[in-house]
């Protein structure tokens, strides 16, 4: 079947990094500079993404893969493939349309991005507060009040290795 298909469509033989050039009798031609084709059998090459301004190049474009951008210091990526760069704020702040704003009492943000979130209400999950919340940290919930007998230790667990928002998109 593959042989029949390639006899019918010579373009299917063109590998990634090339395109099927109709102007040259459907010969496989290399992608021109600043363009790429990530799959075989393509009739055109795609223009490479250019990382300009607040974007910076994380991975250069090659003949078989597009460039990848991230953001300059003080900004972070948003959207699929880092389609936007958004201003960082400090922990304990959130970005509003008017700029960075401190979290109100009872809310926190442990990242340089995202919103100020209400502290977890431990009692709603049948637990008690082990460590109070701050603008930068959520409360730490522990066992239910009934489980805490005199002399029971209240040890703050280690912070998670990565909070939501810190993983690459």
């Amino acid at each position: 079947f593959e042989r029949t298909r390639s006899l019918q469509d010579p373009c299917s033989n063109c590998p990634a990094g090339t395109f099927c050039d109709n102007n040259r009798n459907q010969i496989c031609s290399p992608c021109p500079p600043n363009s790429f084709s990530s799959a075989g059998g393509q009739r055109t090459c795609d223009i490479c993404r250019q990382c300009k301004g607040v974007f910076r190049t994380r991975k250069e474009c090659s003949s078989t893969s597009n460039a990848e951008c991230d953001c300059t210091p003080g900004f972070h990526c948003l959207g699929a493939g880092c389609s936007m760069c958004e201003q960082d704020c400090k922990q304990g702040q959130e970005l509003t349309k008017k700029g960075c704003k401190d979290c109100c009492f009872g809310t926190f943000n442990d990242q340089k991005r995202g919103i100020c979130r209400p502290w977890t209400n431990c009692s709603l999950d049948g637990k008690s507060v082990l460590v109070n919340g701050t603008k930068e940290r959520d409360v730490v919930c522990g066992p239910s009040p009934a489980d805490l007998s005199p002399g029971a230790s209240s040890v703050t667990p280690p912070a998670p290795a990565r909070e939501p928002g810190h993983s690459p998109q």
């Epitope: 109100c104 991005r113 995202g114 919930c141 909070e163 993983s167």
Partner: antibody
Amino acid sequence: QMQLVQSGAEVKKPGASVKVSCKASGYSFGGYYMHWVRQAPGQGLEWMGWVNPNSGGTNYAQKFQGRVTITRDTSASTAYMELSSLRSEDTAVYYCAREGYGLGLDLDVWGQGTLVTVSS
Amino acid sequence: SYELTQPPSVSVAPGKTARITCGGNNIGSKSVHWYQQKPGQAPVLVIYYDSDRPSGIPERFSGSNSGNTATLTISRVEAGDEADYYCQVWDSSSVVFGGGTQLTVL
């Protein structure tokens, strides 16, 4: 690709509890808050709450406080929503949805939904 | 608590432009997200942060937000755009959805 797969349909009696699961794949489970949203037949979307997949911290809509518990199992990349003291008005499709990033709060990946029917 | 108001239904002829509004007190200060939901399916994010499109969403979908009204605009409407559309914001401690608008393509 990024996917949220929910547990199957449930039929419950009034007063009972239901626990719906939501298994994440194709992305770092620990990197994104997980939300639960429900939709009664012929009605709009109603937010129930979220869980922080790392700390287990939660936030619930006032309407559901005391009746809903959202948890997670990071080793299984799975979030759970348990609703207790069920009544007929809780008959709905329950969705889990992953939170995106940044200014505001968008839900960029949704599960297929789980129909919970409450009937005597 | 914060409320979002949408018209229950909007009708439009194929190829024309549909505008779906979402009203809320000073909504222009918030980030608005829009979802499309077809019968029997889960919602799909079509606009986020007022006017940005996720990958895979056609350029025909656009959004704007100022004052007390956010608007989802669908240009060159197609039969496949027929669905319910919901706006959504974050307000201090909860996620708030509009009541939804049923878009009918005539």
